[in-house]
């Protein structure tokens, strides 16, 4: 059977048929259905939704749809003993308490099982002490406090504003600074866009709104009790003291009305500069402690949440490939939400549902993809990417041999301005070519391509006439596939025009106000942006699963490797004397990148010329493309982060959401001037250059002619 025969009709016609079948009205209907009640991981409601999705995917025509369950560590507030923070006077009397829950949005007042705001996996505790305001609690904020301002956070309760970096990194930084508790709050400067009303009259965060979220530092481990292995029926579980990534101090989130009451009394040092001031009418004094009249008052946290091993359920659907059933293209997104999940995740889940329906329609008409497509509805993403990671741990041997690509499908929108794509360089050309074929949904770009509106609104900083495509970081379910297993991965969604606020999320992120109405009234009334995201995600899956030659261009990897090598060399050259003293050379890395570039170029030439009707040669060339991402995996992992194994990319050690290039070298160089043993520190830099150079060279050789 030739590869075209199996698909019945020509690939271009297939793609058009698939895209034409996607309907905005269906996405809208699915979003409504998925958002009427909360679907918190580990709850009966989320189990019922899993079974509903299983049933509907079967109806849509998938070959099989199974539930995959795991028993993982989750965290919940105590229903009878609520979490809150107090201001206490010298007698220990509580003179102010933070809110116990968010005011429910209109129409949802009688909904039960809305989990109150909490920081998942916070330990229990009732610390009391003076407050220190630590800005965003980034690494550089603590450097400013400790090194420049000589403020000691040891034994203090710190209050940090949400935004800029993943909340787990904030907590880790506070712990390292010696804090005994952390209060996280949403400042209007980061979560209230000027000129927009707060919900329910607009998409801004009201003063009573609070961002939930986990505060783990898992570094890719998955379930904290079973790192590296699936949390199945016969799993050996670590004791809680040995669990991976749990915070050691109590943490609690609040809204800006409550934050105002805590911050307005702050005394001590003035903020070091304007970047430490938010938008509240408070002085943003750093502390420690309250000002004169209130100096005897303290802050007390009351945290009673519990960690519990709980069953979670992934839904895994299979559409078997006609020609290469042992090659898997995966589309996955999570199903669990903090509350209603109007954006996160159900705007993504609704899109996946419609993509499955469209593929199912084609299959019912006799079509099959060339390669197998796996669809996944992940559970417990909000608790640390647990569902996807456990499934990948259980199926790692299959995935590392058969995994072609993973496309992530969390929130379809975080704004309605333009497209945002993060992916492996292997997918750059796929994304460019696909978006040139899709219509832009943007006002003022009628009749123009998505590529054109995207490039105009979000231009590449390096290449004129091309759109920005970002590095993959983490904080979502692609992590295990890309950072641990080395499967080419990508994600796409519609975003806001707010580059400076890249990692803060949209104002109502993880609050009770993330409802269907938020999307339908304010973000995407016509669901045209959702449809566009469905076309991008679905189109990528279609091409990856159906093109005869995999749509990966290894030359784009060569380009970025050179860019990343230049960047890390520039960072190192800030220390010219030490580089000379310790004989630090990047020659091996630049040589490896040069070799990679030449070999990739020759491979691409061969890819144009080879006989595509020879199934053995075709499979051989495709395998070289598929395994290229895998070749960047170091089986030993990064220092102290064994599950981050990709040598070219890892989540930043200072912000899980952000991607870092040549992370091993970057971390070895970070703050190197403060290291007590410079010889040892520069020795580690040299070792990391060696690892990177070797890996790039080894990856290049996988593209060489096989014999």
């Amino acid at each position: 059977k030739s590869s075209n025969e199996a698909t019945n009709i020509t690939p271009k016609h297939n793609m058009k048929a698939f895209l034409d079948e996607l309907k905005a009205e269906n996405i809208k209907k699915f979003l409504y259905n998925f958002t009427q009640i909360p679907h918190l991981a580990g709850t009966e409601q989320n189990f019922q939704l899993a079974k509903q999705i299983q049933s509907q995917w079967k109806e849509f025509g998938l070959d099989s749809v199974e539930l995959a369950h795991y028993d993982v560590l989750l965290s919940y507030p105590n229903k009878t003993h609520p979490n809150y923070i107090s201001i206490i006077n010298e007698d220990g009397n509580e003179i102010f308490n933070t809110s116990l829950f968010e005011p429910p949005p209109p129409g949802y007042e009688n909904v039960s099982d809305i989990v109150p705001p909490f920081s998942a996996f916070s330990p229990q505790g009732m610390p009391e002490g003076d407050l220190v305001y630590v800005n965003y609690a980034r690494t550089e904020d603590f450097f400013k406090l400790e090194r420049d301002m000589k403020i000691n956070c040891s034994g203090k309760i710190v209050i940090a504003r949400y935004g800029k970096v993943f909340r787990g990194n904030k907590v880790k930084n506070a712990q390292l600074a010696g804090a005994k508790g952390v209060i996280l709050y949403s400042d209007p400067a980061d979560y209230f866009a000027p000129g927009v009303k707060s919900y329910p009259d607009g998409w801004n965060l009201p003063g009573g709104g609070v961002q939930r979220g986990n505060i783990l530092n898992l570094n890719g481990a998955g379930d904290p009790l079973t790192p590296g292995y699936p949390a199945n029926e016969y799993a050996y579980r670590r004791g809680i003291a040995e669990a991976v990534g749990l915070p050691s101090i109590p943490v609690h989130p609040i809204g800006y009305y409550d934050a105002q009451k805590l911050l307005e009394k702050m005394g001590g040092s003035a903020p070091p500069d304007s970047s430490w001031r938010g938008s509240l009418k408070v002085p943003y004094n750093v502390g420690p402690g309250f000002t004169g009249n209130f100096s005897t008052q303290k802050v007390k946290m009351h945290i009673h949440s519990t960690n519990e091993v709980t069953r979670i359920y992934n839904v895994i659907g299979t559409l078997r490939g006609a020609v290469e059933p042992d090659r898997y293209v995966i589309l996955g997104g999570h199903r669990d939400s903090w509350v209603f999940g109007g954006i996160d995740p159900q705007s993504g889940a609704a899109v996946v549902h419609e993509i499955v329906r469209s593929f199912g329609t084609l299959k019912k008409e006799g079509w099959r993809p060339r390669r197998t497509i796996l669809f996944a509805s992940w559970d417990a993403e909000e608790f640390g990417l647990l569902g996807s990671t456990e499934w990948a741990e259980e199926n790692s041997r299959l995935l590392q041999e058969r995994g072609v690509a993973y496309i992530n499908a969390d929130s379809s929108i975080e704004g309605n301005y333009t497209l945002r794509v993060d992916c492996t360089p292997l997918m750059y050309s796929l994304v460019h070519n696909l978006t040139k074929e899709l219509k832009s949904p943007d006002e003022g770009f009628e009749g123009k391509s998505l590529y054109e509106s995207w490039t105009k609104k979000s231009p590449s900083p390096e290449f004129s006439g091309m759109p920005r495509i970002s590095k993959l970081g983490s904080g979502n379910d692609f992590e295990v596939f890309f950072q641990r297993l080395g499967i080419a991965s990508g994600r796409a969604r519609y975003t806001k025009n707010w580059e400076t606020n890249k990692f803060s999320g949209y104002p109502l992120y993880h609050s009770v106000y993330e409802t269907y109405e938020l999307v339908e009234k304010f973000y995407d009334p016509m669901f045209k942006y959702h449809l566009t995201v469905a076309q991008v995600r679905g189109g990528m899956v279609f091409e990856l699963a159906n093109s005869i030659v995999l749509p990966f261009d290894c030359r784009d990897y060569a380009v970025v490797l050179r860019k990343y090598a230049d960047k890390i060399y520039s960072i190192s050259m800030k220390h010219p004397q030490e580089m000379k003293t310790y004989s630090v050379s990047f020659d091996s890395l630049f040589s490896a990148v040069k070799n990679f570039t030449e070999i990739a170029s020759k491979f691409s030439e061969r890819l144009q010329d080879f006989d595509k009707s020879n199934p053995i040669v075709l499979r051989m060339m495709n395998d070289q493309l598929m395994f290229l991402e895998r070749a960047f995996i170091d089986p030993l992992g990064l220092p102290d982060r064994p599950f981050y194994r990709h040598v070219i990319y890892a989540p930043s050690s200072h912000n899980k959401y952000a991607g870092e290039s040549f992370p091993g070298i970057y971390d070895a160089l970070f703050d190197i001037e403060s290291k007590v043993d410079p010889s040892k520190a520069w020795g580690e830099v040299k070792r990391q250059i060696y690892v990177a150079a070797f890996t790039v060279q080894a990856a290049a050789e996988t593209l060489s002619e096989v014999a």
Epitope: T98, F101, P103, E109, G208, K261
Partner: nanobody, 123 residues
């Protein structure tokens, strides 16, 4: 439409107790801080008590602190004022009022009032 209806007033002897109720309709009590305010005969308005929407904080005028307790039953959409150790100077028309700020943490301005219920403390 949005309204507040107070009840439970009456004549009571000094030192005795009374419980006022305020039934809210047309809006969910669960989202709003609520106040009790009173007006003694021939006097101006006096703020009495405030409770946040989630009942996490209660604030009282000094004149009633330790004697009056503000509470609510969000499921019944009803606010209460338990008045103990009543005194002659507590004689007034008692109004419940909605705080204008959804989710407010401290007393602010009122945007909706009831028609009031009369409490007379007399031997």
């Amino acid at each position: 439409q949005v309204q507040l209806v107070e009840s439970g007033g009456g004549v009571v002897q000094p030192g005795r107790s009374l419980r006022l109720s305020c039934a809210a309709s047309g809006f969910p009590l669960i989202s709003y801080g609520m106040h009790w305010v009173r007006q003694a005969p021939g006097k101006g308005l006096e703020w009495v008590a405030f409770q946040t929407y989630d009942a996490s904080n209660r604030y009282y005028a000094d004149s009633v602190k330790g004697r009056f307790t503000i509470s609510r039953d969000n499921s019944k959409n009803t606010l209460y004022l338990q008045m103990n150790s009543l005194r002659a100077e507590d004689t007034a028309v008692y109004y419940c009022a909605r705080d204008r700020i959804v989710g407010g943490r401290v007393p602010d301005a009122f945007d909706i009032w009831g028609q009031g219920t009369m409490v007379t403390v007399s031997s």
